[in-house]
Structures are given as structure tokens and as C-alpha cells.
């Protein structure tokens, strides 16, 4: 087993400045062994609200690379293949958990972080504000 | 600070049967303090590929509640408000990290787990397979 480092600069479970410290086994268990999330990989092109994927990279974070969706158009693609601005392409966002070393450079001490990522885009009817 | 439980049924950092154990601070830092993920909360109704949100709850998991999207229709909503089956509503999926208590009921001992969640739905042009 791994011994939590005794480096005085790295926190231990008794440290009052390191609240709500828990032990986590980093051997990731995959609940979706029979599913392939990549089966939806071409939706970004086939969608009426298509999106591009941009690489968000941070080596100090796990996962280090997160692919972020950016909607290609303000409007949506209609049956003729043109952009219809009476509809709106909007990003679908989700908060995900990531790990970050804290303090930096301590090998076995981490902090959970929540980040908001855009996963894809959907086509919505716009909210129309009527002028009184 | 929290003391790692000495309950003999719960592992500690020296436990050889609990490999790659690290300390994680659960005081979650939110990188998106200026963003409100709920601003997109009505997209599920306004989308041309609307979805219902189902509560997936598991007290042994963190986060214990995850909202899962299920597309309401096979097709997409057209300009007349009817379902157009020439298009398909499909779920946008993403793999996310969660923490699972392991062994169960141990308050400060977790395992990383990867699960596939449906975040929302988008409307796509179907793939047509032509019979030769």
C-alpha cells in the first residue's frame, strides 16, 4: 500500500487546515463496461445545432484534457442546410468533478474541483421579449 | 480536522489491499463561480429534441444525486410543434468521475468511478443505410 507522505509541507489526515479529508482509491472502476460513449461521436456534425470541439488542457488537473463544445452557429440548420436564425443553437452544460494536486507537487494529496463544461449543443426556440 | 476512521472494517493508508490510496480534500473548489449552470435549465423544454430529467440517486456515491436526460421522442419537434420522424432526438453522453464509498458505509473511504451520463438531447439527421 502507499504511505501518505510525511513531507511536512504535505498535509495529513490530522491536519486541521485540511478539512474533510478522505482516502480515495485511484483504481478507477468503470460502470459502463458494455457501453461505448464514442458511438455518439459524430453527433457534432449531424446535429441541427452542430458544434466544434476544443481542447482544454491543464497538466496539473485530472483529466488533463477535456474536450469542450462550442456551437458553430447562433441559429440552427434547417431542412435546406441553411442557418435559421429564428432558432438558437445553445450549449448543454454540465458540472463535472476533476482532481487537482493540492498543495502542488505533493504526490498523494489532492483536492476535488468542480468545473462547468459544454458537452454539446441543442436547438431551442428563442425566448421572445415583447416590448410593451 | 477529520480523523480517518479506525474502524477495522474500513481501510487506512497502510492497507495493502487498498492500493493507490491518496488523500482527497472534499471541500470542493468551484472554478465556475461566475457562471450559473441553471441558466440552461429550461433548454430541456425549449429544445427541438426535448428531454426529461430523471433523478439517479445513490447514497453510496458522491455526488449522490445525478440528473439523467431521456429524450422525449424518437423524432424532433418541427416548426408546427409536431414530431418529425425524419430527424432523430439523441442523447449527448459524457463520462464523468464520481466517488463511491468502498467498502460501503465507510464514511471516509472512497473509490474513483467512471460513469456514463446523458446530459441532454440534440436533433440529428439520421444515418440512412441504402440497401444494395
Amino acid at each position: 500500500g502507499i504511505t501518505i507522505p510525511r513531507n511536512p509541507g504535505c498535509p495529513n489526515s490530522e491536519d486541521k487546515n485540511f478539512p474533510r479529508t478522505v482516502m480515495v482509491n485511484l483504481n478507477i472502476h468503470n460502470r459502463n463496461t458494455n457501453t461505448n460513449p464514442k458511438r455518439s461521436s459524430d453527433y457534432y456534425n449531424r446535429s441541427t445545432s452542430p458544434w466544434n470541439l476544443h481542447r482544454n488542457e491543464d497538466p496539473e488537473r485530472y483529466p488533463s484534457v477535456i474536450w469542450e463544445a462550442q456551437c458553430r452557429h447562433l441559429g440552427c440548420i434547417n431542412a435546406d442546410g441553411n442557418v435559421d436564425y429564428h432558432m438558437n443553437s445553445v450549449p448543454i452544460q454540465q458540472e463535472i468533478l476533476v482532481l487537482r494536486r493540492e498543495p502542488p507537487h505533493c504526490p498523494n494529496s489532492f483536492r476535488l474541483e468542480k468545473i462547468l463544461v459544454s458537452v454539446g449543443c441543442t436547438c431551442v426556440t428563442p425566448i421572445v421579449h415583447h416590448v410593451q | 480536522g477529520i480523523t480517518i476512521p479506525r474502524n477495522p472494517g474500513c481501510p487506512n493508508s497502510e492497507d495493502k489491499n487498498f492500493p493507490r490510496t491518496v488523500m482527497v480534500n472534499l471541500n470542493i473548489h468551484n472554478r465556475n463561480t461566475n457562471t450559473n449552470p441553471k441558466r440552461s435549465s429550461d433548454y430541456y423544454n425549449r429544445s427541438t429534441s426535448p428531454w426529461n430529467l430523471h433523478r439517479n440517486e445513490d447514497p453510496e456515491r458522491y455526488p449522490s444525486v445525478i440528473w439523467e436526460a431521456q429524450c422525449r421522442h424518437l423524432g424532433c419537434i418541427n416548426a408546427d410543434g409536431n414530431v418529425d420522424y425524419h430527424m432523430n432526438s439523441v442523447p449527448i453522453q459524457q463520462e464523468i468521475l464520481v466517488l463511491r464509498r468502498e467498502p460501503p458505509h465507510c464514511p471516509n473511504s472512497f473509490r474513483l468511478e467512471k460513469i456514463l451520463v446523458s446530459v441532454g438531447c440534440t436533433c440529428v439527421t439520421p444515418i440512412v443505410h441504402h440497401v444494395q
Epitope: S41, N45, N52, L53, P63, S64, V65 | P19, R20, E95
Partner: antibody
Framework: QVQLQQSGPGLVKPSQTLSLTCAIS??????????WGWIRQSPGRGLEWLGR?????????DYAVSVKSRITINPDTSKNQFSLQLNSVTPEDTAVYYC??????????????WGQGTLVTVSS | DIVLTQSPATLSLSPGERATLSCRAS???????LAWYQQKPGQAPRLLIY???NRATGVPARFSGSGSGTDFTLTISSLEPEDFATYYC??????????FGQGTKVEIK
């Protein structure tokens, strides 16, 4: 099952361009769950990653700093293959060159499928 | 770039013995992005372990990986004749930082 088949000349003259091709079967060069890379191996340098291509709504190219100014990796979607071009070669570029599939999920990264390797000698 | 230092350079053991191979990184790497490969003469490397501790498909249970931070270990619990080969660790820190160790050769004593 996924297989990678390499082809290309085994002898290249100094200052010329080294060109190799890797044909993919059982997967797609445009797959969004993989990246396609080149790695070389020589007694002096050991295993050295050279670069990769991956497709995520557009093509991404990543090259090792050591060869960045001389390398190009291109996809050929019509033939489901990708190629390596290394310009201005010197005898130090003599090595066994491997193409490989890099599993590129958000949570893991590793090379699970390798080509058979091509010994390229740079000599006049 | 992160340097991976493998030790020992050569390990002389007999079939049935336990082999412990070390891989030390010059700075912290995410264990999830640490892999081990086996290579036999004239062959391409073969994936053994990914994510520091996950066995690849078809890899026998006698192979196991462990470690985090800067120190990683590949263990072969009981050497079989076909296990005598060279073993490499590999890390991915970022899209432009991917390096291999120099290898440990496991030879028959």
C-alpha cells in the same frame, strides 16, 4: 481486430525526406476515441514519441519539440491511413519507426496497437 | 520534458522468481497516464499495464502495476520463460509531453 500495417522505404539519403505510411484496418483514422501516432526506437535514443494526429470535429496535430520543425503527420481518410514525413534527415534519424494507436479517452492514454515497425537507415 | 528513469537496467532472475521493476519520474505524473510495455527482440512493444495498475486485455494476472506521484512499479509475481524481455514505462503529461523510460531488461540467470 485492429491492425496497423506499415510501408515505406528502408533507406533514405541524408538531407532527404523520410516518408512512411500506416494503413489501419478494424478502426477509422477519423475515430474520436483514438489518436494515431509515430514512435521511433534507436540504440542511442531508446523509444521516442514523435507526434500524433486526432480528429475531434477537426484535425489536431501534436509534434514532439525535438522534431517539430521537420515533421508532418497527415491523415488519408479515403484510404483509412496516415503518414509520417520527416524532412532534412541525418544519420541520427536512423531508427526503427513504429506507428501506433493511442487510446485517447479523457481518463486514460496509452498505445494499445502497434505496427510491425520499419527500420529506416539514413545513409548516402 | 519529464524524464522516466527505470531501474535496474538489467535484472537477472530464474523462472519462477519474482521480478520488481521500478520507474521513477523526474516530477509528478498522473498515475492514470502511466503505462508499461513489454518488448521482445525484433518485435513491437506490447501494452501490459495502463493507468499504472490496469492490466491490458489478455495480459496474465502475474503482471501487476502500482504506484503514484513519481514512483511506479511493475511486478511479475512468478517469471515464466516467455516473460524474459525488455520492459518500458511511459507517461503522458500533456499533449506535447509523452516520454518513455530507457527500459529494464529481464534476462535468465
Amino acid at each position: 481486430q485492429v491492425q496497423l500495417q506499415q510501408s515505406g522505404p528502408g533507406l533514405v539519403k541524408p538531407s532527404q525526406t523520410l516518408s512512411l505510411t500506416c494503413a489501419i484496418s478494424g478502426d477509422s483514422v477519423s475515430s474520436s476515441s483514438a489518436a494515431w501516432g509515430w514512435i521511433r526506437q534507436s540504440p542511442g535514443r531508446g523509444l521516442e514519441w514523435l507526434g500524433r494526429i486526432s480528429y475531434r470535429s477537426k484535425w489536431y496535430n501534436d509534434y514532439a519539440v525535438s522534431v517539430k520543425s521537420r515533421i508532418t503527420i497527415n491523415p488519408d481518410t479515403s484510404k483509412n491511413q496516415f503518414s509520417l514525413q520527416l524532412n532534412s534527415v541525418t544519420p541520427e534519424d536512423t531508427a526503427v519507426y513504429y506507428c501506433a494507436r493511442e487510446v485517447d479517452s479523457m481518463y486514460y492514454s496509452y498505445f494499445d496497437i502497434w505496427g510491425q515497425g520499419t527500420l529506416v537507415t539514413v545513409s548516402s | 520534458d519529464i524524464v522516466l528513469t527505470q531501474s535496474p537496467a538489467t535484472l537477472s532472475l530464474s523462472p519462477g522468481e519474482r521480478a520488481t521493476l521500478s520507474c521513477r519520474a523526474s516530477q509528478n505524473v498522473w498515475a492514470f497516464y502511466l503505462a508499461w510495455y513489454q518488448q521482445k527482440p525484433g518485435q513491437a512493444p506490447r501494452l501490459l499495464i495502463y493507468g499504472a495498475s490496469n492490466r491490458a486485455t489478455g495480459v496474465p494476472a502475474r503482471f501487476s502495476g502500482s504506484g503514484s506521484g513519481t514512483d511506479f512499479t511493475l511486478t511479475i509475481s512468478s517469471l515464466e520463460p516467455e516473460d524474459f524481455a525488455t520492459y518500458y514505462c511511459q507517461q503522458y503529461r500533456s499533449t506535447l509531453s509523452l516520454t518513455f523510460g530507457q527500459g529494464t531488461k529481464v534476462e535468465i540467470k
